[in-house]
């Protein structure tokens, strides 16, 4: 029998190279069955992980899976960091692991994205 | 030339509502977010948020949240900020400005939209 | 919140002589620091971006410097049509945040 638990799916030590001034979409992949729970995300901060708080975050369905997705526009250099999903299920916490933002500092003008860049994010 | 053209000044009563207008020309409008500001009587700067005319995703200052709402239109090249329930602390002139990227930075500013909240 | 302090408030300058204006950041912003100019009635112009680019079309007396904390606007030798607020901003980090600016004044 397929458990009911939700389940989120960010694989452990994985990451994303990005650059400032762009935009960005941080996904959560979330399995649940009947209800889906209250997701949060939140930045880590040395061993504690910050809450963040009115950011902007959609969901986006596919299939058998949901995405909670944390919005950047655009990415500013101190986003830079690891940042966990959390789901409040039954009144217990499920996290997620640790997803890291490595963003570069892009500073020559002439380093910016190409026309469709930004269109194709 | 790249313009940003603003609505007109806007007088209104404490309690009512705007949308400031902001029309993009002379570049790709889809190529840059758009950024507003207020300044109030002349003095500091304020960010109110920034849109990506592509998909109308917004980051907001958390003082303004709530406050003003910015929208695009992508048809016309415009984009808008709705500004609801005024009081006179909201009485100030906005600016729109487009965002240069990596770093982002302000690198063409409308001529301001000049808000007069007074009974 | 980081907060950008611009000092002096005011000064005045006679034409030909060198200005140096500060901006101090409450914590490091590396160098996503901006400089806008803004002549009286009008809006903001852009002249420096990543704390030293000038930008297109600025006269090369604006030079921008500082990395971290601190940043300065000199101008090499003031004009008339220099007389304007100074403000400068950060993006480095959300809220992105403006100092008081500095308005330079002709004697």
């Known amino acids: 029998k397929e458990s009911c638990d939700v389940q989120l799916y960010i694989k452990r030590q994985s990451y994303h190279s990005i650059f400032a001034g762009d935009p960005f979409k941080l996904e959560c992949p979330v399995k649940y069955c009947a209800h889906r729970p209250q997701v949060t995300w939140c930045k880590l901060n040395g061993t504690t992980c910050v809450k963040l708080e009115g950011r902007h975050t959609s969901w986006k369905q596919e299939k058998n899976l949901s995405f909670f997705i944390l919005h950047f526009e655009p990415v500013l250099p101190s986003d830079n960091g690891s940042y966990r999903c959390s789901a409040n299920f039954l009144s217990a916490i499920i996290e997620s692991h640790s997803t890291t933002l490595y963003v570069t500092d892009v500073k020559s003008a002439s380093e910016r994205p190409s026309k469709d860049e930004m269109a194709s994010r | 030339e790249v313009q940003l053209q603003q609505s007109g000044p806007e007088l209104v009563q404490p309690g009512a509502s705007v949308k400031i207008s902001c029309k993009a020309s002379g570049y790709t409008f889809t190529d840059y977010y758009m950024i507003w500001v207020k300044q109030s009587h002349g003095k500091s700067l304020e960010w109110i948020g920034n849109i990506n005319p592509n998909n109308g995703g917004t980051t907001y200052n958390q003082k303004f949240k709530g406050k003003a709402t910015l929208t695009v239109d992508k048809s016309s090249s415009t984009a808008y900020m709705g500004l609801p329930s005024l009081t006179s602390e909201d009485s100030a002139v906005y600016y729109c400005?487009?965002?240069?990227?990596?770093?982002?930075?302000?690198?063409?500013w409308g001529q301001g939209t000049t808000l007069t909240v007074s009974s | 919140n980081i907060v950008m302090t611009q000092s002096p408030k005011s000064m005045s300058m006679s034409v030909g002589e060198r200005v140096t204006l500060s901006c101090k950041a409450s914590e490091n912003v590396d160098t996503y620091v901006s400089w806008y100019q803004q002549k009286p009635e009008q809006s903001p112009k852009l002249l420096i971006y990543g704390a030293s680019n000038r930008y297109t079309g600025v006269p090369d007396r604006f030079t921008g410097s500082g990395s971290a904390t601190d940043f300065t606007l000199t101008i090499s030798s003031v004009q008339a049509e220099d007389l304007a607020d100074y403000h400068c901003g950060q993006s480095y980090s959300y809220p992105l945040t403006f100092g008081a600016g500095t308005k330079l004044e002709l004697i």
């Open positions: 400005a487009r965002g240069g990227l990596r770093p982002l930075y302000f690198d063409y």
